[in-house]
Interface confidence: low
């Protein structure tokens, strides 16, 4: 800190006074000095440190007509709203020639009613859920004792006897108000009143009850809602997208969700008009007269696949002796899911039909029993997804193989020795 020298008489003719008051007080500190020649700039120190951003003004009045005559300089430091950080020792400092001069100190102190550093805040809490409220106050004068009040009723017999900075509330079943009183030698200060709104608990166990290609039925268990009955629950569904990063704690979906309201009870809702074989994320919140619960985490769900909407295309069935070669192409109609394979049914005029699961191949060779004398053999093919069969093709009669026709080589699938189905199948 700068040090004044006493080699010459101090120029200060006035030093800062003392200010003691309550928070928020406005006050002014002044220094006055008389110097010969050009007046210097006055700096303010607090506890020995220069205040760079002090709210100060300086006035200079010459005592004579000559520039070299004496000047009276007054510097004023304004403290606009007294805070604890303003307290300390204040001095003025000037540089004159090669010397530094410091005024005598003044003191700024704080004393009065307690001051709240932290007050209870309005908040929402889930019913029957523990939470904490904070309150912090200081003097001077110390000590400061706190008294908590719930709905204007003290929670302790006397200040300082109950919880102090933190009040633990084990849970509420109705919306309540909390405040805090701070007591010191100068008196009592009351904090703001915080309203703690009791909302329903987050629903639990959001789960699928049933799935269909274009609808999902979901159910959940409602949380407690205190004395306030639930009025409705809101379900949101959003199309999942690998790149969208829905996380358990993410507050908002990345796109506009599909929102549905369910009157309660029952705590169940059927979501319709969905896409088949499509991943969604869903969440639910329930509302009482006090407001909505928090959302559940996003639950990934998926509509099941639908069946293909059309039969396989371009089916051809060719016979060559005791073998029949059948091939086809994927349906042009939407598959509504992942194609898992094809089923083929064939039947002769006087023989039971046979149903085969071909897998994903698009051709099959049937090894016919006997000498190939089965007459009027017809073949039907259907594509299937996880949801089941699509429509079967119209029966395709076997054509006799003509020389020159290509016939790919592939695995033979033999007909069971005892055919086993009623025709038509489905």
């Amino acid at each position: 800190a700068p040090r004044g020298t006493q080699a010459e008489e101090s120029p200060f003719v006035g030093n800062p006074g003392n200010i003691t008051g309550a928070r928020g007080l406005t006050g002014t500190l002044r220094c006055q000095l008389q110097v010969q020649g050009e007046p210097p700039e006055v700096h303010w120190l607090r506890d020995g440190q220069i205040l760079e951003l002090a709210d100060s003004t300086q006035t200079q009045v010459p005592l004579g007509e000559d520039e070299q005559d004496d000047w009276i300089v007054v510097s004023q430091l304004r403290i606009t709203s007294l805070q604890l950080s303003d307290t300390g020792q204040y001095q003025c400092l000037v540089f004159l020639g090669h010397q530094t001069f410091v005024s005598q100190p003044g003191y700024v102190g704080l004393e009065g009613l307690p001051y709240f550093l932290e007050e209870p805040e309005d908040r929402t809490v889930a019913a029957n859920t523990p939470f904490n409220l904070s309150c912090q106050a200081q003097g001077p004068p110390e000590p400061v004792d706190l008294l908590w009040l719930q709905d204007a009723v003290p929670l302790a017999t006397a200040p300082g006897h109950g919880p102090q900075r933190s009040l633990h509330v084990p849970g509420l079943n109705k919306t309540s108000s909390f405040s805090c009183e701070a007591h010191n030698a100068k008196g009592v200060t009351t904090s703001r009143t915080a309203t703690i709104t009791v909302l329903p608990q987050q629903p639990r166990n959001l789960h699928l009850v049933s799935r269909q290609p274009t609808e999902l039925e979901v159910a959940w268990t409602p949380g407690l809602s205190g004395i306030y009955p639930l009025t409705h629950c809101t379900l949101q569904a959003v199309l999942s997208d690998d790149g969208m990063g829905i996380q358990a704690g993410e507050p908002d979906p990345p796109e506009e969700p599909l929102t549905s309201q369910a009157s309660v009870p029952p705590h169940q809702l059927r979501l319709g008009s969905l896409h088949p074989h499509t991943p969604y994320h869903i969440r639910v919140a329930c509302t009482s007269s006090q407001g909505p619960s928090s959302w559940t985490h996003w639950l990934p769900v998926e509509t099941p696949e639908g069946v293909p909407l059309g039969p396989p295309e371009n089916i051809s069935a060719t016979r060559n002796g005791s073998q029949a070669f059948v091939h086809w192409q994927e349906p042009r109609a939407p598959l509504q899911g992942t194609l898992l394979g094809y089923r083929l049914a064939y039947q002769g005029q006087d023989t039971p039909e046979v149903l085969m699961d071909i897998g994903l191949r698009q051709e099959v060779t049937l090894e016919l029993q006997g000498d190939g004398s089965v007459s009027n053999l017809t073949v039907c093919v259907a594509a299937y997804t996880a949801a089941g069969d699509g429509p079967w093709s119209l029966p395709v009669p076997l054509e006799a193989w003509r020389p020159g026709q290509a016939q790919p080589v592939h695995q033979l699938v033999k007909e069971p020795s005892t055919p086993a189905f009623s025709w038509p199948w489905w």
Epitope: Q212, P304, L355, D357, G359, A386, G388
Partner: antibody, heavy 120, light 107 residues
Framework: EVQLVQSGAEVKKPGATVKISCKVS????????MNWIRQPPGKGLEWIGL????????SYNQKFKGRVTISADKSISTAYLQWSSLKASDTAMYYC?????????????WGQGTLVTVSS | DIQMTQSPSSLSASVGDRVTITCKAS??????VAWYQQKPGQAPRLLIY???TRHTGVPSRFSGSGSGTEFTLTISSLQPDDFATYYC?????????FGQGTKVEIK
Amino acid sequence: EVQLVQSGAEVKKPGATVKISCKVSGYSFTGHTMNWIRQPPGKGLEWIGLIKPSNGGTSYNQKFKGRVTISADKSISTAYLQWSSLKASDTAMYYCAHGHYESYFAMDYWGQGTLVTVSS
Amino acid sequence: DIQMTQSPSSLSASVGDRVTITCKASQDVSSAVAWYQQKPGQAPRLLIYWASTRHTGVPSRFSGSGSGTEFTLTISSLQPDDFATYYCQEHNSTPLTFGQGTKVEIK
């Protein structure tokens, strides 16, 4: 949770008819097939037939055709197996089983079984 | 009909043993074979389908292999809960047929 709940045990005289039921829950009844399988006491499994509840299409094991009728009631998600002209050799545990979505013919969920006893 | 022949019809083994059950189809069934486990008084439970695909919730000690006409179910380390009867079944075409079963007993 997928559940298949079958009707209770039956005792029948030879020549009689029995009808047993299989009520399903936990999945879309009409989107899958229901198989029926039987197992005589101390013996292996024997496939009887299946139904696609969405349209009532059926397939039967030729061995039992004519004596067996498989049906379904979509409105109550229930499949039925009716067996006529019962013989003592038809004494068995009868199971319904849900066809796996990747192959109708592999059975992923089974009922608890219905014991049918044929005795004079 | 396709016949499915299982072997052995029964076997005795100890906890921790590696157990192999085979199943032969009378004709090529591609890879359309399922394996089931059945305990006394209970319905069968699907273990494997399409020869080697484990059904949901089936422990990894169960594995299946094979194609064409020869198929195998392997239990890599037999557990007390695994003593049961095992059936193979072709799921290629109807009528569906099962093997006669393999009973795995405690040695």
